[in-house]
């Protein structure tokens, strides 16, 4: 990488190296030959997360409840607020700027992976021998009832949306 004129945590201004402001502080005035860089702490609801020469701190992210957001981790002078979604919702992006309702798996499909605050429900088709007869964000595919173990016989075959129907065995007269 190219040579730099200053030490780490310094910047070049007016042919002189000045100290950067530490995280959580903003630049008020550059250093001179006789004075150090002047920095001020960020205000309430503001932050700067790197060594910097910014004259303004960044505003903390607002977790808008109208968008289904809530605070997961409160911001500090050195870190931004982290938002997540209300129960039953998940973020639409990595930045979590808005939320959408968790997807439900339709009949014939079961939940492979339950949704989190940052990922949607993952559905999978119910394979042969399994069914789901509800639209749900939690229900997995259920196995068909085993008629034999109940000493019954299959009267109606199961599908991916319905269970088998068991009935009594025909008696010989």
């Amino acid at each position: 990488e190219p040579p730099t004129a200053c030490r780490e945590k310094q910047y070049l201004i007016n042919s002189q190296c000045c100290s950067l402001c530490q995280p959580g502080q903003k630049l008020v005035s550059d250093c001179t030959e006789f004075t150090e860089t002047e920095c001020l702490p960020c205000g309430e609801s503001e932050f700067l997360d790197t060594w910097n020469r910014e004259t303004h701190c960044h505003q903390h992210k607002y977790c808008d409840p109208n968008l289904g957001l809530r605070v997961q981790q409160k911001g500090t002078s050195e870190t931004d607020t982290i938002c997540t979604c209300e129960e039953g919702w998940h973020c639409t992006s990595e930045a979590c700027e808005s939320c959408v309702l968790h997807r439900s798996c339709s009949p014939g499909f079961g939940v492979k992976q339950i949704a989190t605050g940052v990922s949607d429900t993952i559905c999978e088709p119910c394979p042969v021998g399994f069914f789901s007869n509800v639209s749900s964000a939690f229900e997995k595919c259920h196995p068909w009832t085993s008629c034999e173990t109940k000493d019954l016989v299959v009267q109606q075959a199961g599908t991916n949306k319905t269970d088998v129907v068991c009935g009594p065995q025909d008696r010989l007269r």
């Epitope: 042919s15 190296c17 000045c18 100290s19 030959e33 150090e36």
Partner: antibody, heavy 126, light 107 residues
Framework: QVQLVQSGAEVKKPGASVKVSCKAS????????MHWVREAPGQGLEWMGW????????NYAQKFQGRVTMTRDTSISTAYMELNRLRSDDTAVYYC???????????????????WGQGTLVTVSS | DIQMTQSPSSVSASVGDRVTITCRAS??????LAWYQKKPGKAPNLLIY???TLQSGVPSRFSGSGSGTDFTLTISSLQPEDFATYYC?????????FGGGTKVEIK
């Protein structure tokens, strides 16, 4: 007491590489930048670059960019300077030199060298 | 890069003489300047930093002055052990640069 002890003299052929070590003792190795300075026969002092032993960050003089690599091993408080593609005009005494403490400097780079290694003579000859 | 020009390149003097060496920077470097003494086969020895601050353990006959572009190293009364080469070095920005050196020889 502070000491910087360098590796011994080296004789190299043109095109080869050399790696010089500088073992620090008597102070907190990660608290001070380490610089490398060379003195060629009949020439003055020439700054080559620095390494921050704490972060591993480096800064090389433009002249040596692409040919020099400065590294460190904090577990043994040792800095290294490797120079590649050696030429006859790289024949010189190479010194490591300790800078002022990290955080000491607020304006300027304030790189003054209060402790030096004993020097390592590198001779490049075919 | 900042060029550092030292003068004279050599000076012949006797024990007890007052010796003055000057160093000029190609651009303003505030007070970010150091002076070193260098003897053959030895590592340099820091004498003065921030233009005028005497390094611990250095005799008070050495003094430095100047700021901006013009700097001076003065040896008020030359001693036998002072015969050496003296270098200035700017510490304002990287790359660090040294003057060409001034050799102080016995007259």
């Amino acid at each position: 007491q502070v000491q910087l002890v360098q590796s011994g003299a080296e004789v190299k052929k043109p095109g080869a590489s050399v790696k010089v070590s500088c073992k620090a003792s008597g102070y907190t190795f990660t608290g001070y930048y380490m610089h490398w300075v060379r003195e060629a026969p009949g020439q003055g002092l020439e700054w080559m670059g620095w390494i921050n032993p704490d972060s591993g960050g480096t800064n090389y003089a433009q002249k040596f960019q692409g040919r020099v690599t400065m590294t460190r091993d904090t577990s043994i408080s040792t800095a290294y300077m490797e120079l590649n593609r050696l030429r006859s005009d790289d024949t010189a005494v190479y010194y490591c030199a300790r800078d002022q403490p990290l955080g000491y400097c607020t304006n300027g780079v304030c790189s003054y060298f209060d402790y030096w290694g004993q020097g390592t003579l590198v001779t490049v000859s075919s | 890069d900042i060029q550092m020009t030292q003068s004279p390149s050599s000076v012949s003097a006797s024990v007890g003489d007052r010796v003055t060496i000057t160093c000029r920077a190609s651009q303003g470097i505030y007070s970010w300047l150091a002076w070193y003494q260098k003897k053959p086969g030895k590592a340099p020895n820091l004498l003065i930093y921030t233009a005028s601050t005497l390094q611990s353990g250095v005799p008070s006959r050495f003094s430095g002055s100047g700021s901006g572009t013009d700097f001076t190293l003065t040896i008020s009364s030359l001693q036998p052990e002072d015969f050496a080469t003296y270098y200035c070095q700017q510490a304002n920005i990287f790359p660090l640069t040294f003057g060409g050196g001034t050799k102080v020889e016995i007259k």
